[in-house]
Each structure stands twice: as structure tokens, then as C-alpha cells.
Interface confidence: medium
């Protein structure tokens, strides 16, 4: 048993928030400022993430955990751990490489992020349009035309103007 213990890596005793310092006979040293170690037995501490520019600090870095960032107003997080901040658009718009653009006719976006999506085609479910769609809202489908009183007509919205491969005249 003694032999086994002497073969054990002395660094495994170093807790989170410290590192095993090779320059000081492998004693456990606290992580320097602006660095952290989230697990024990580490030979180095990781540099804290800095939330700069469009990023803002959601949680400060500590000796045992990295800083967490979110985005300044007008932007939203994208990617794991908020690796990117993407510009918000208004409802009824989508973000393109040229900035925020209004949704084309036949499409909508009810959020400040994401892209415009085609209105629901009520006729595919055998229903009629109860409320017309807008740039900000999808159509509302109602009962099927057969369920409506005589003379009622079904309105089917056209295909989105910018769906690839389609050419509005």
C-alpha cells in the first residue's frame, strides 16, 4: 500500500482553484488573477474569458469557474456559451448580410431573431384563411371551406416571394 501511495501523482491532490506548480516541487498554488481551474489536479489554470465590446459580463470569473458573457441590448447570443452576438432585428424582419430587411410578402417573423418563414398554407390542411398573415404574424387558419356558409371563399396565400427557385413576376 505504501508503494502505491508513493506512485500516486501528487498533483491529484490539488483542488479546483489551484494548479500543480512544477516550478515549486509540484505544490498546489492558487490560480493567478484572471485565471481559473474548474477541476482538481490541473497543471495550469485557464485564462478567464473577457466579455468585451458587444459582449457583457453575466457572471464574473472566479478561481474555480470561467466568466460567462451575454450580449448588450440590441443583440442576442448565438452558439454554445454565447460564442457570438448577433444583431436583433424588429419583428417582421430578418437579419441578412446587409443588415435587417423586411420579410418578403408571404413570409413572417414574430421574433427579433431568426429568419422570415412562409405563412402557413391553410389549404394543405383543407382549411381556409380566417385572418390574413402579415410580416409579423402567420395566417390564422379557420374551418374548411366546406364547413363555411354558402358563398364563403377560401383565400390561399401565394408562395413566399423569395423562396429559392420561385420567381415572382
Amino acid at each position: 500500500f505504501e508503494r502505491t501511495r508513493s506512485l500516486q501523482d501528487p498533483c491529484s491532490n490539488c483542488p479546483a482553484g489551484t494548479f500543480c506548480d512544477n516550478n515549486r516541487n509540484q505544490i498546489c498554488s492558487p490560480c493567478p488573477p484572471n485565471s481559473f481551474s474548474s477541476a482538481g489536479g490541473q497543471r495550469t489554470c485557464d485564462i478567464c474569458r473577457q466579455c468585451k465590446g458587444v459582449f457583457r459580463t453575466r457572471k464574473e470569473c472566479s478561481s474555480t469557474s470561467n466568466a460567462e458573457c451575454d450580449c448588450t441590448p440590441g443583440f442576442h447570443c448565438l452558439g454554445a456559451g454565447c460564442s457570438m452576438c448577433e444583431q436583433d432585428c424588429k419583428q417582421g424582419q430578418e437579419l441578412t448580410k446587409k443588415g435587417c430587411k423586411d420579410c418578403c410578402f408571404g413570409t413572417f417573423n414574430d421574433q427579433k431573431r431568426g429568419i422570415c418563414r412562409p405563412w402557413t398554407n391553410c389549404s394543405l390542411d383543407g382549411k381556409s384563411v380566417l385572418v390574413n398573415g402579415t410580416k409579423e404574424r402567420d395566417v390564422v387558419c379557420g374551418p374548411s371551406p366546406a364547413d363555411l356558409s354558402p358563398g364563403a371563399s377560401s383565400v390561399t396565400p401565394p408562395a413566399p416571394a423569395r423562396e429559392p427557385g420561385h420567381s415572382p413576376q
Epitope: 448565438l78 452558439g79 460564442s83 457570438m84 448577433e86 430578418e94 441578412t96 448580410k97 446587409k98 430587411k101 431568426g114 429568419i115 416571394a161 423569395r162 423562396e163 429559392p164 427557385g165 420567381s167 415572382p168 413576376q169
Partner: antibody
């Protein structure tokens, strides 16, 4: 049917100029962003420039910035690329394409070859 | 600039086999902005997939796209003779618009 037809390519000496045209038909030209994309012989695709529907906003690849100018005439349904101070590395087939911004380039012309050589 | 790296450079397969093409971005790209194109010799590129996974009009359902963040995949479930071509991914998330260097799918 959507059609894009490029013209204006040819052989030009280094330092020379050339103006490419792209005639569009089969869709409402004035409603769409348009782009130029090029392809050097045996190489991949390289985006060159784009222009918004009104012609007021343009963007360029760094490799052509200050030398190329994109423009459009919506009354003629035509897209242009004015290329000045041409270099050997500008040798390529130049395609015009309808640009759906988020959704990529859904229609392309057949391309016009520009050769820059002395 | 977002660099798109495609792999493999060349894929040698037989008709009827499954083709899996990879496109890796140097930074995260919202999947809405990722497209795939097919190009045959002497022809212009043709849009296959937009929004990472939506087939363009007229594209057979043997073509499918998937992925998010930095890793995207184009899959051709059963290669037909007309599918042997070069395939490019492209991002329109930010300027400059960039394409991958291409993957050539050739007959084994």
C-alpha cells in the same frame, strides 16, 4: 423562366479595363439583390460583389475593392461590373447570380470568360 | 472572414453508394445562412440546399443537408450517374460571402 445572360468578357492586357453586363429576364429584376461570382480556371468559386435592389448599397471582396464597380439599371433589367486596373489573377469566368441574401444564389448565368494577359 | 473548409477534397464512389460531404466553418454560422451547390464541368453552379437543410425547388430528395454551428453535412443517399460533380458550401451570414474549396465526387 428566369434567365441571366452575361456578356462583355474577353482578352485584356494587365492594367486594362472591361465592362461586363448581365441581362435579366423572367422575374422582377428591381426586387432582388444581385451578385457577381467568379471562378478562376480549375479553381473554386469566389464571391466578387453584390448590389441591393435600388443600387444604393454595394459590397466588394477585398481582392477587387477600389478597382471594380458594380451597378444596375432597373429600367433595362441589366446588372453591370466595371473592371479597371485588371490583373492576371482576375482571369476567371464571371457569373452573375440572383442573390436571395439569407438563402444563397438561386439562379446563375452561364458565365463570361475574362482573360487578363499580355 | 469566415473560412469554410470542405472534406474530403475528392470522394471516389460508385453509383448507388451513399456520399457524405463535410463543410466546417472557422466560426459559428447560423444554419439559416448555409447553402450547398452542385457544379458540373462547363456549367454554372446550381443551388441544392439552403438554410443548411432545405432543398431548393426541383432538387431530388436523395439530397439532404444537416448541421449547425461550425459543422455542416451534405448527404446524397444513393448516387445517380448525374450526381458526379463538384459540390460547394457557401455562407451568407457575414461579409465577405465565402465558399468552401469544393469536394469532387467522382466515379470509382
Amino acid at each position: 423562366e428566369v434567365q441571366l445572360l452575361e456578356s462583355g468578357g474577353g482578352l485584356v492586357q494587365p492594367g486594362g479595363s472591361l465592362r461586363l453586363s448581365c441581362a435579366a429576364s423572367g422575374f422582377t429584376f428591381s426586387s432582388y439583390d444581385m451578385s457577381w461570382v467568379r471562378q478562376a480556371p480549375g479553381k473554386g468559386l469566389e464571391w466578387v460583389s453584390d448590389i441591393d435592389p435600388t443600387g444604393s448599397k454595394t459590397d466588394y471582396a477585398d481582392s477587387v475593392k477600389g478597382r471594380f464597380t458594380i451597378s444596375r439599371d432597373n429600367s433595362k433589367n441589366t446588372l453591370y461590373l466595371q473592371m479597371n486596373s485588371l490583373r492576371a489573377e482576375d482571369t476567371a469566368v464571371y457569373y452573375c447570380a440572383r442573390d436571395l441574401l439569407v438563402y444563397g444564389f438561386d439562379y446563375w448565368g452561364q458565365g463570361t470568360l475574362v482573360t487578363v494577359s499580355s | 472572414e469566415i473560412v469554410l473548409t470542405q472534406s474530403p477534397g475528392t470522394l471516389s464512389l460508385s453509383p448507388g453508394e451513399r456520399a457524405t460531404l463535410s463543410c466546417r466553418a472557422s466560426q459559428s454560422v447560423s444554419s439559416s445562412y448555409l447553402a450547398w451547390y452542385q457544379q458540373k464541368p462547363g456549367q454554372a453552379p446550381r443551388l441544392l440546399i439552403y438554410g443548411a437543410s432545405s432543398r431548393a425547388t426541383g432538387i431530388p430528395d436523395r439530397f439532404s443537408g444537416s448541421g449547425s454551428g461550425t459543422d455542416f453535412t451534405l448527404t446524397i443517399s444513393r448516387l445517380e450517374p448525374e450526381d458526379f460533380a463538384v459540390y460547394y458550401c457557401q455562407q451568407s451570414y457575414s461579409y465577405p460571402v465565402t465558399f468552401g474549396q469544393g469536394t469532387k465526387v467522382e466515379i470509382k
